[in-house]
């Protein structure tokens, strides 16, 4: 029978399928970065090349034990995960171990940045097909070392990281914290965040999906046929490379912002029991476990969004947060969101050549998040019309003049800190589609697109009775590429994105306050990528 | 993802007043030193000094160097373990934490960051 | 139900020894480390000694270096305690408790069973 | 003798806050994670807080812990009855390669 993890991530049109690169060969390589390996067990024999690298700290204590079988035990667990024959993801990858922890697992930050030189090496000295990188290790936030995976990234190097085991923010820890890693959480056979004890999994912003990481059968290195049980997100990242290296195989162009956007839209949403985590990072942490994507051929030019948010602002009277999308990624809308509500809203403006979204903290605030709507459009011209504040009582209207550009975002940032004298922006599709309304002493922002083929809607719901939040979906081969919260109450949290769903939070105190005529609306634009059609606002 | 989360950044960026050497007089440093916030994890005594992106590879050499000589003149000696060129210019180097002002000040640093420990997960 | 019991204690002579053994249930035992806590009648806590998840490293007390040994059968989740040479201040509560994780061992315990008495008297 | 100092006792009435220090050196709490723990009358110590901070699950939010440099400080508030017990701290020490605990401090509700 097959082991849970791989039925939760080989989804059963895959399992027999054989993945393979256009030409027959399967040209991708990954890269273990991790205790020494036991290159001979039968698992992984002849799919190992262990290369000479090695640096490792001295193992601590005076009566330290040192045993081959000890000192290959993580490593050769991990490649087993990745590729082995029996309960590998890859069955057939070839992968190259390079020796970062010692027999106790520990490394260190600059053992780990000679080893990722050593790879950028290896790709200057003979260029292969894709690499991914598994970096199954964590240690406190660093900043180099973040910086060392940017560079790497950026070479077209994928790279797959552990969460960490700390059941803590994984912004915390390096390389878990690098936006250009694919950063990988651990569940259970239930679907659930993995418990070590006190410990745990890491969540939070920095995390991208979760991955089985309890109890996974791999390649033990106590004999050459040995097998045993492991668990943490090394065993979750090692089968998100192994999927990674499965895309790869198939589709060897795939580059890291395609992968990792598939991995999220193809991942399963919704299982995981978001209590489990602390209840500032349940909004934050992404309820996405991992399954292998069909092909890029099977599912068409479907147009992809992920939600990225920002670092907290943290409380000072003009905290900004800023969220990024990834270099290859369009920014299609800008959100905010504050806990205590008191926020002056968000813009997109434009930092060294990238729109970047910015949200501002409100005096008396404890502080924003920033949240972005970052999409792939093939060949998208994308750019931001804004209107400054209008006089008192008077409406700010913004849209999308250019030809064929549609509206895929709004934006709104209130001059004025007394969040007394404001309403709420407006979002108008009926007697206005396509445009950003503004009121009283708003700024307003709208992005606007052009790409063959992409259409766009505005769908709003609104709830007049007490409600935490109120939530649009857009329908079936329609993606959410704006969010927004509309009139109602005085307070509201603000919006976000979580998959296709757009989420307007208010704040208790206004569920009380607000009378049945005001109600609130979530706004969602929703978006498709038609190739065959011109761009155009659907009514 | 990119912000500078639990992370401990010292600003060691004092005016040079050493030697009477123009170039180092007139240099005043403005790289910081950053350590990892989980005090058990760190590993004093190995410095990773990460230069400005744009620096060229004899620049990254020259500037190993210069530290070496100038650690020498007090009395210091210090190992250059490593010399990064192929994923950002810097180098490795393991040196008393007394001089961490002194290489702050050397052109061409960004930052030095203490090493620390990383664990298998 | 995460579980450690420790068995073995009782009276004994001094310079005569004694096994202590733990239990442990409830959890992967061979993902953790382990450590023996002792308590002297109305004093403090004090640490005696710690193994890694593997067996694969050891850490002692000064007041037992040489005389203690801690050991661990994964296959049987049991961690044991070998007290030689006993001493009168020796005599304590002596608890078994569990790493908060394997590597990262200087985090404390945060699981401990309900100890057993060793009584050192001629 | 511990290399760990904490006041042998405190006390306050309940619903109040009590603080207890635990004094160390660069080589114990400068440079490890210092952990918490309670030991009521008669039964095995307990983890309150680890990583300097943390609580696992299951203990209330009244238990807090800090660090500053080598001092380490546990707070209780809204004290009740059923907190009256034995706190100690406890820490690795890397110049001794082994982990220390607290003296100890005997919380009293009045």
């Known amino acids: 029978s097959i082991p849970w993890n791989l039925e939760r991530i080989i989804p059963a049109w895959h399992q027999t399928e054989e993945d393979r690169s256009p030409d027959g060969s399967s040209q991708v390589e990954v890269y273990l970065l991790d205790t020494s390996i036991q290159g001979a067990h039968r698992e992984i024999e002849g799919r190992v090349t262990i290369t000479d690298f090695n640096s490792v700290p001295e193992e601590d204590g005076t009566r330290f034990h040192r045993q081959a079988s000890k000192c290959d035990s993580h490593g050769t667990h991990l490649a087993g995960v990745v590729s082995g024959r029996d309960a590998g993801v890859a069955k057939g990858t070839s992968l190259h171990s390079l020796r970062v922890l010692n027999c106790q697992g520990k490394g260190t930050v600059s053992g780990t940045l000679i080893g990722l030189e050593f790879i950028r090496k290896s790709q200057l000295i003979q260029p292969s097909g894709p690499l991914v990188v598994l970096l199954p290790l964590a240690g406190g936030y660093s900043r180099i070392l973040n910086a060392a995976c940017r560079h790497l990234a950026r070479t077209g190097v994928v790279l797959v990281a552990a969460a960490g085991n700390f059941r803590d923010d994984a912004c915390l820890y390096s390389p878990a914290s690098a936006p250009e890693v694919i950063t990988v959480g651990a569940t259970n056979a239930q679907d659930q965040p993995v418990t070590l004890g006190t410990l745990g999994t890491n969540f939070g912003r920095c995390v991208d999906l979760f991955a089985p990481g309890k109890d996974i059968i791999g390649a033990s290195s106590d004999c050459s046929t040995c097998f045993m049980s492991q668990s943490g997100t090394s065993q979750a990242a090692a089968h998100v490379a192994g999927i990674v290296a499965r895309m790869l195989s198939r589709e060897p162009t795939l580059t890291l912002a395609e992968l990792r956007q598939r991995l999220i839209h193809f991942s399963t949403k919704d299982v995981i029991n978001m209590a489990w985590f602390p209840e500032d990072q349940q909004v934050l942490t992404p309820n996405l476990v991992a399954t292998l994507p069909p092909s890029t051929h099977e599912t068409g030019g479907q147009l992809l969004c992920r939600t990225v948010w920002s670092a907290h602002s943290g409380p000072t009277r003009t905290a900004t947060a800023t969220a990024r999308c990834a270099p290859e990624e369009e920014l299609l809308s800008c959100s905010s969101f504050s806990r205590s509500g008191r926020r002056r809203g968000d813009w997109i403006e434009a930092i060294g050549g990238q729109q970047v979204c910015k949200a501002l903290n409100a005096f008396g605030g404890e502080g924003v998040y920033a949240v972005a709507r970052c999409c792939l459009v093939p060949r998208a011209n994308c750019s931001i019309h804004n209107t400054p504040a209008a006089r008192a009582g008077l409406e700010t209207h913004v849209h999308c003049h250019q030809k064929d550009h549609v509206l895929t975002g709004c934006s709104f940032h209130w001059e004025v800190e007394d969040l007394s004298v404001r309403r709420q922006p407006a979002l108008r599709s009926r007697r206005q589609p396509g445009q950003c309304v503004g009121h009283q002493a708003a700024s307003v922002y709208a992005s606007c697109c052009h790409a063959p083929g992409l259409e766009c809607k505005i769908k709003e719901h609104g709830i007049s009775g007490p409600s935490e939040q109120v939530t649009v979906a857009c329908e079936a081969g329609w993606t959410l590429t704006g969010c927004n919260v509309l009139p109602g109450a005085s307070l509201t949290l603000g919006a976000y994105s979580v998959d296709n769903l757009c989420v307007a939070r208010v704040h208790d105190t206004a569920r009380a306050d607000r009378t049945s005529g005001e109600a609130t609306v979530a706004a969602a634009i929703c978006c498709r990528s038609r190739p065959s059609a011109k761009a155009s606002w659907v009514q | 993802q990119d912000e500078d989360g639990d992370y401990e950044e010292l600003m060691l960026a004092l005016p040079s007043q050493e030697d009477g050497l123009a170039d180092e007089a007139a240099h005043v440093a403005t790289a910081t030193f950053r350590r990892c916030s989980k005090e058990a994890w760190r590993l004093p005594g190995t410095y990773i000094v990460v230069l400005m992106e744009e620096t060229q590879r004899l620049q990254i050499e020259q500037t190993a160097h210069r530290l070496q000589t100038r650690a020498a003149r007090r009395g210091y000696v210090i190992k250059v373990l490593h010399i990064f060129y192929d994923l950002f210019p810097g180098f490795l180097v393991k040196m008393s934490s007394d001089l961490l002002g002194l290489a702050l000040k050397l052109p061409h640093v960004e930052y030095i960051e203490e090493d620390s420990f990383v664990f298998a997960q | 139900q995460v579980h450690l019991v420790e068995s073995g204690g009782g009276v004994v002579q001094p310079g005569r020894s004694l096994r202590l053994s733990c239990a442990a249930s409830?959890?992967?035992?061979?993902?953790?480390?382990m450590h023996w806590v002792r308590q002297a009648p109305g004093k403090g806590l004090e640490w005696v000694a710690l193994?890694?998840?593997?067996?694969?490293?050891?850490y002692y007390a000064d007041s037992v270096k040489g005389r203690f040994t801690i050991s661990r059968d994964n296959s049987k989740n049991t961690l044991y305690l070998q007290m030689n040479s006993l001493r009168a201040e020796d005599t304590a509560v002596y608890y078994c408790?569990?790493?908060?994780?394997?590597?990262?061992?200087?985090?404390?315990?945060?699981?401990w069973g309900q100890g057993t008495t060793v009584t050192v008297s001629s | 003798q511990s290399v760990l100092t904490q006041p042998p006792s405190v006390s306050a009435a309940p619903g109040q806050k009590v603080t207890i220090s635990c004094s160390g050196s660069?080589?114990?709490?400068?440079?490890?994670?210092v952990s918490w723990y309670q030991q009521l009358p008669g039964t095995a110590p307990k983890l309150l807080i680890y990583d300097y901070n943390k609580r696992p699950s299951g203990i209330p939010d009244r238990f807090s812990g800090s660090k500053s440099g080598t001092s380490a400080t546990l707070g209780i508030t809204g004290l009740q009855t059923g907190d009256e017990a034995d706190y100690y701290c406890g820490t690795w020490d890397s110049s001794l390669s082994a982990y220390v605990f607290g003296t100890g401090t005997r919380v009293t509700v009045l």
């Open positions: 660069s080589s114990n709490i400068g440079n490890n994670f």
């Open positions: 408790a569990r790493a908060i994780a394997a590597l990262y061992y200087y985090y404390g315990m945060d699981v």
């Open positions: 409830g959890f992967t035992f061979n993902s953790f480390g």
């Open positions: 193994i890694w998840s593997d067996g694969s490293d050891e």
